[in-house]
């Protein structure tokens, strides 16, 4: 019989008492085969973290700073359940740490030196740890003691709870630095008042502070937020302009064998029976013998944290950077205005080899990081382990939902001004063998399908989106008799046609021979009835252009396109017979890397782009013998995006809507995790 006990860790007598009450009340409402609670008492949160890691306890609820400690080795804990605040309809699990300024003050984030600062309190998250952690490497050396470095960075401050004797500048704007509401500039509202009164130039608070203090929109319009990219935004655009997004209060468990499903089952049932306004005799979010015992008193309920989400992703790049800077106190030696090498994310070993060659040729400008799937690469870019990669539009959508931004677009047509003219896109097509003359768009049911990969534009999002509109369900593996759609569940019929050996079967990378445009076309040639690819795929792999044994004798005339009106046309008539226009592949990165990635890639394409004529004797960035490694092989240049610099603007309303409709069919664990952080 599996042990269905969750050992909750309590950090005080009062918590232990509440835990026992929780245990007893749960026993009274949950069947004997359901989850149960046991209580473990420890002296501190850090002791609880260690106990969970050592399998002496299973769960505890932590503030963000402690979630970071819990994640660090050797603890390796992960977030499993989040408390939410507000309403069930609009649950808030995060708050945003922001830098508020007056509208007419004219400086940016990188010009804070010499300004006057208002903080909620020394050592507090939004008011101190996050802003000072993010500014850490701009502070004058020596950076220890930290208070002295901060005092020397700003021209004056109010940092309640600081030592006014040792660091008088930190108390210059609020004499005495009182650590309670007796100090008019203490806490969130106090720090904002410090700005409002004109004592300070910037207030470090949370996003809701300004709304709680200024009910009138006209008053709020006198303030702006400083963004990390050295721009400003209105105060209601905090989701796009903040210092960090911080989880409020989170249940953590072991990463391996951590009982996360059981913990969720327990807490979900607990909130049903003892949540807000549910029961008089025991209330989960109430602490008669103290404050915030086990859970925050202000919580309204729990949400399950998506399983793909580790602590780094949950806390977010900015928060992790800030806390790591404060804890480790290390800064790069290079001057900050110089670009560090761009860490390119390469998929599996084929791309890694090409990336390594690029790295050798780039003279220190490019480094390489490997991952097994595109989603793993996106996650690495999010958390700073990697910086950039070029993505199909379907993954630009996921990357965008995860906070990444497009920086340059692949262009596929030769033109005089290639780098300045991003193209409208390419065509997604359905290809069949000419010999299968009865096959049309309207009778694909039961046929064998070949896809570039799940989640990609031409190979999945466009054809499956169109199909979904017709069949109104997501069971595409039942619609086709079998197929190869790399990235599908291994036991799916959409992995049956794939050719990868062993663990590589149906993997969404080049270890699967039927992956990508060329792979999907090969699948059609060798096994399938229809391939969903781009309009250039057939000509690029026929007429001797692909020397591989399977392709060298193929003839373009032996293939036709399926049109949406039920007719068929020759391959060259793609402009009048396609499924949809697809946005070109694009390079994505984190916002903080945007300028450097742009600069370095433009240099790199001038050295190794399509101006290089002899690719056998020189490194060519856009060539890999039809394998589309790192970039599509038909890339002519990487083009500036001009104002199409967000994923929505880049992909276009129509495509974003189409992918949004397919979201109900999405198997992307990363998309699920990212929409948890930003619904």
């Amino acid at each position: 019989v599996p042990d269905k006990t969750v050992r909750w860790c309590a950090v005080s007598e009062h918590e232990a008492t509440k835990c026992q009450s929780f245990r007893d009340h749960m026993k009274s409402v949950i069947p004997s085969d359901g989850p149960s609670v046991a209580c473990v008492k420890k002296a501190s949160y850090l002791d609880c973290i260690r106990a969970i890691a050592a399998n002496e306890a299973d769960a505890v609820t932590l503030d963000a700073g402690l979630v970071y400690d819990a994640y660090l080795a050797p603890n390796n804990l992960k977030p499993v359940v989040a408390e939410f605040y507000g309403s069930k309809e609009d649950p808030q699990t995060f708050y945003y740490a922001v830098a508020v300024v007056k509208k007419d003050s004219g400086f940016q984030m990188n010009q804070l030196r010499g300004k006057k600062s208002c903080h909620t309190g020394l050592g507090r998250s939004a008011g101190w740890n996050i802003p000072i952690g993010l500014l850490y490497c701009d502070l004058p050396e020596p950076r220890k003691p930290l208070e002295k470095a901060v005092a020397n960075f700003f021209s004056g401050s109010c940092a309640p709870c600081a030592d006014g004797t040792d660091f008088p500048q930190l108390c210059q704007l609020c004499p005495g630095c009182g650590c309670s509401t007796l100090n008019q500039y203490f806490g969130y509202s106090g720090a904002f008042k410090c700005l409002k009164d004109g004592a300070g130039d910037v207030a470090f608070v949370k996003h809701s502070t300004i709304f709680e203090n200024l009910a009138n929109k006209a008053d709020r319009d006198q303030y702006e937020l400083l963004c990390l990219d050295n721009t400003r935004k209105p105060v209601d655009e905090y989701k796009d302009c903040h210092l960090a997004q911080v989880p409020s209060h989170t249940v953590v468990a072991r990463s391996m064998g951590g009982k996360e499903d059981l913990i969720w089952e327990l807490l979900n049932q607990a909130q049903e029976h003892f949540g807000k306004d549910k029961s008089k005799e025991f209330q989960l979010f109430s602490s008669p013998h103290g404050k915030d015992l086990l859970f925050k008193d202000s919580a309204h309920g729990f949400l399950k944290v998506p399983p793909r989400m580790d602590a780094k992703m949950y806390l977010g790049y900015e928060y992790v950077t800030a806390i790591r800077n404060l804890r480790e106190g290390t800064c790069p030696e290079a001057p900050t205005d110089e670009c560090k090498p761009v860490k390119w994310c390469a998929l599996s070993h084929h791309e890694r080899l090409k990336c390594d060659e690029w790295s050798v040729n780039s003279v220190g400008k490019i480094e390489c990081v490997s991952a097994e799937t595109t989603e793993d690469c996106i996650a690495k870019i999010m958390n700073g382990e990697a910086d950039a990669m070029s993505l199909d539009g379907g993954f630009v959508y996921i990357a965008g939902k995860c906070g990444l931004v497009p920086v340059l677009a692949e262009n596929y047509n030769k033109s005089d001004n290639c780098e300045d003219t991003p193209e409208a896109g390419y065509f997604a097509i359905a290809v069949v063998k000419k010999s299968a003359s009865d096959l049309t768009w309207d009778n694909l049911k039961g046929k064998k399908s070949c896809h570039t990969a799940v989640g990609r534009t031409a190979g999945w999002n466009i054809p499956m989106g169109l199909l979904y509109n017709k069949i109104n369900h997501c069971r595409f593996d039942e619609f086709f008799s079998e197929g190869c759609a790399p990235g599908s569940k291994k036991d799916s019929s959409l992995c049956k046609l794939c050719m990868g050996s062993g663990l590589n079967l149906c993997e969404p990378n080049n270890k699967e021979g039927y992956y990508g445009y060329t792979g999907a076309f090969r699948c059609l040639v060798e096994k399938g009835d229809v391939a969903f690819v781009k309009h250039q795929t057939v000509p690029q792999n026929t007429g001797g252009k692909n020397p591989d044994p399977w392709a060298k004798n193929l003839n373009e005339k032996d293939y036709e396109l399926l049109c949406l009106d039920g007719t068929r046309k020759p391959v060259e008539e793609y402009a009048n017979c396609h499924l949809a226009r697809a946005p070109n592949h694009a390079v994505v990165t984190r916002k903080d890397k945007e300028a450097c990635v742009h600069k370095i890639l433009r240099q790199q394409q001038h050295l190794f782009g399509s101006n290089v004529t002899d690719c056998s004797g020189n490194f060519c960035l856009f060539r890999s013998e039809t394998k589309d490694l790192l970039f599509r092989d038909d890339t002519v240049c990487l083009a500036k995006l001009h104002d199409r610099n967000t994923y929505e603007k880049y992909l276009g309303e129509e495509y974003v809507k189409a992918v949004g409709n397919l979201r109900k069919c999405s198997t992307s664990s990363l998309l699920e995790a990212c929409t948890f952080r930003r619904p």
Epitope: L353, K354, E357, V360, C615
Partner: nanobody, 117 residues
Framework: QVQLVESGGGLVQPGGSLRLSCAAS????????MAWYRQAPGKQRELVAG???????KYADSVKGRFTISRDNAENTVYLQMNSLKPEDTAVYYC???????????WGQGTQVTVSS
């Protein structure tokens, strides 16, 4: 097709030196980039050092200052001079000509380097 044959490995004490050679059966003069990789048991194959046709080099952080890569286009050979060897340098060392290696798994047999006292 150019075949690559690695040699020069062996057993050496910590602090010792070895010089690996990679001989090509055809011309390497036109190959854009040549490189040495290594693979320790249970680990991924990793780039140790690379050299472009023009002589630009790159080294893994773990070998910087200890290893030197060079190429002799006339002799169709690439070398890896390894000094101040450490136990963690123990691995099979492979040489590759990038112009083919990422289209097909184009690797030689490699040469075993063991650093042990």
């Amino acid at each position: 097709q150019v075949q690559l044959v690695e040699s020069g490995g062996g057993l050496v004490q910590p602090g010792g030196s070895l010089r690996l050679s990679c001989a090509a059966s055809g011309s390497i003069g036109s190959s854009a980039t040549m490189a040495w990789y290594r693979q320790a048991p249970g680990k991924q194959r990793e780039l140790v050092a690379g050299i472009t046709r023009g002589g630009t080099t790159k080294y893994a952080d773990s070998v910087k200052g200890r290893f030197t890569i060079s190429r002799d286009n006339a002799e169709n050979t690439v070398y890896l001079q390894m000094n101040s060897l450490k136990p963690e340098d123990t691995a099979v060392y492979y040489c590759t000509d990038y112009s083919r290696s990422y289209y097909e798994d184009h690797w030689g047999q490699g040469t075993q380097v063991t650093v042990s006292s």
